[in-house]
Interface confidence: low
């Protein structure tokens, strides 16, 4: 069967198309091409007589058509009006006619698009922005790219106007990105230059750094303020409510206790009209803002009840501190047998009783800081056992025996098992 194939089917303006004939019959007298879906003398493009090899242009001939001996038709410099159907009329030697129709579509080569915007300076959480891809082109598909990736799914993003318009509702600073639009049709695809969406925001609540509150007299006070903002915030400092200077950083050398007070950073964005403040308290004091961890030393950690006494000493290198003692989460002293001396540095228990067995720790503190020691375990033994029943584990003494008179934690029992194996190995 006679058929026509258009190569290509979608043709760009200015290009060419070949209407290729398949299954052309033998013994032909001639053939003729017509614009449209039927044979119409008024719309004849060209006729060809095989015997004379003569091509005769018809009323629809434009000068851009070339007919080949195999009946195929080449149309050059395609224009929009060329789109549609073409009919080949074949006249056989027996004067029996045969027809076939083919078609192609013509599309424009798309121009490079550009983006127009209805709001070049949107404010965060307040404004919407509509981008429109220009120009409007028939039969074109519109696509959008954000940072060279396809549009994310978001309820704040809306495509309209045949995807030609992209609207961002309640813009956020994260919408500050590179936007491009792309136009596509079956013969071309063009992408716009990027447009940077500039979302105005802030200032956010300022942060004052460093975070230190306590300074020693004679130190330099250097504070820096930062608030996320677009355009960048303008900063000012107040001390105890009094304006000092309009800078991002505040520097006061050789501070004294008189520099203690409230330091306010004020951040202002003149474009959004918003401002935020943060207040920081600065304390200038000789006191140490960080008290070192104290250590407990014991005259002995395993004692005989109703017979021995014990001294616990809380060691610290800090000055200007106070000391308090704790036993099983209770503040000491808790009985007449317990005495504190040397400014609470030493806790003496005389004599030691069964109820004194357990964990002790001390705490050192000043008005602005405190720290506590690791606990120490006091074991009270009522059995007179030989010395070999005591073993040394990590420089602490634990009682080894099954009398059940010792207040020892499960964790220390495990350590004892490990230590006993070690102890026996060395004997």
């Amino acid at each position: 069967k006679l058929t026509i194939e258009s190569t290509p089917f979608n043709v760009a303006e200015g290009k060419e198309v070949l209407l290729l004939v398949h299954n052309l019959p033998q013994h032909l007298f001639g053939y003729s091409w017509y614009k449209g879906e039927r044979v119409d003398g008024n719309r004849q493009i060209i006729g060809y007589v095989i015997g004379t090899q003569q091509a005769t242009p018809g009323p629809a001939y434009s000068g851009r058509e070339i007919i080949y001996p195999n009946a195929s038709l080449l149309i050059q410099n395609i224009i929009q009006n060329d789109t549609g159907f073409y009919t080949l009329h074949v006249i056989k030697s027996d004067l029996v006619n045969e027809e076939a129709t083919g078609q192609f579509r013509v599309y424009p080569e798309l121009p490079k698009p550009s983006i127009s915007s209805n709001n070049s300076k949107p404010v965060e959480d307040k404004d919407a922005v509509a981008f429109t891809c220009e120009p409007e082109t028939q039969d074109a598909t519109y696509l959008w790219w954000v940072n060279n990736q396809s549009l994310p799914v978001s309820p704040r993003l809306q495509l309209s106007n045949g995807n030609r318009t992209l609207t961002l509702f309640n813009v956020t600073r994260n919408d500050s990105a590179s936007y491009k639009c792309e136009t596509q049709n079956p013969v071309s695809a063009r992408r716009s230059d990027s447009v940077i969406l500039n979302v105005l925001y802030g200032p956010d609540t300022p942060t004052i750094s460093p975070s230190d509150t306590y300074y020693r007299p004679g130190a330099n006070l250097s504070l820096s303020c930062y608030a996320a903002s677009n355009p960048p915030a303008q900063y000012s400092w107040l001390i105890n409510g009094t304006f000092q200077q309009s800078t991002q950083e505040l520097f006061i050398p050789n501070i004294t206790v008189n520099n203690s007070g409230s330091y306010t950073c004020h951040a202002n964005n003149s474009v959004t009209g918003c401002n935020r403040t943060t207040v920081k308290t600065i304390i200038v004091t000789e006191l140490s803002p960080v008290v070192a961890k104290p250590q407990i030393k014991a005259s002995k950690t395993t004692v005989t009840g109703d017979k021995d006494s014990v001294n616990l000493t809380c060691s610290t290198n800090d000055t200007g501190i106070s000391i308090r003692w704790f036993f099983k989460n209770q503040s000491l002293p808790s009985s007449e047998r317990m005495k504190l001396s040397q400014g609470n540095i030493t806790l003496s228990i005389n004599p030691v009783k069964r109820e004194d067995a357990g964990t002790y720790w001390c705490e050192v503190f000043n008005p602005i800081s405190k720290n506590q020691s690791d606990p120490i375990m006091l074991n009270v033994n009522y059995n007179a056992l030989p010395q070999e029943n005591l073993i040394n584990v990590d420089e602490q003494l634990y009682f080894q025996g099954g009398s059940g008179l010792n207040d020892i934690f499960e964790a220390q029992k495990i350590e004892w098992h490990e230590a006993r194996a070690h102890h026996h190995h060395h004997h």
Epitope: D193, V195, N198, N230
Partner: nanobody, 119 residues
Framework: EVQLVESGGGLVQPGGSLRLSCAAS????????IGWVRRAPGKEEELVAA????????RYADSVKGRFTISADTSKNTAYLQMNSLRAEDTAVYYC????????????WGQGTTVTVSS
């Protein structure tokens, strides 16, 4: 997300030089114009230099012509401001800023780098 990060500021003596860098991410600098804006206490903000790769031109404020040079390295997506023969009046916070082809306002700014010219 579009980001501009400036660096290269510092303290320099009058007559000295500094080179500021502006590293851009989230877009291609060849698609837009990049400018250097300065802000000094008590003074108006001033666009001192701009470069538009896609238009192929640079421009300078009269106050810096012949002393400052703006350039861009599109392979590094970075813009530069070479500042020579610095004067005390050049002391300011210098911000890198983008102008979108939509509006040509230099309205997306980085967070700035401080230049202090003092003896």
């Amino acid at each position: 997300e579009v980001q501009l990060v400036e660096s290269g500021g510092g303290l320099v003596q009058p007559g000295g030089s500094l080179r500021l860098s502006c590293a851009a991410s989230g877009f291609n600098i060849k698609d837009t114009c990049i400018g250097w804006v300065r802000r000094a206490p008590g003074k108006e903000e001033e666009l001192v230099a701009a470069i538009c790769e896609y238009k192929g031109y640079t421009r300078y404020a009269d106050s810096v012509k012949g002393r400052f040079t703006i350039s861009a390295d599109t392979s590094k997506n970075t813009a530069y401001l070479q500042m020579n023969s610095l004067r005390a009046e050049d002391t300011a916070v210098y911000y890198c800023a983008i102008a979108s082809p939509v509006d040509q306002y230099y309205n997306y700014w980085g967070q700035g780098t401080t230049v202090t010219v003092s003896s």
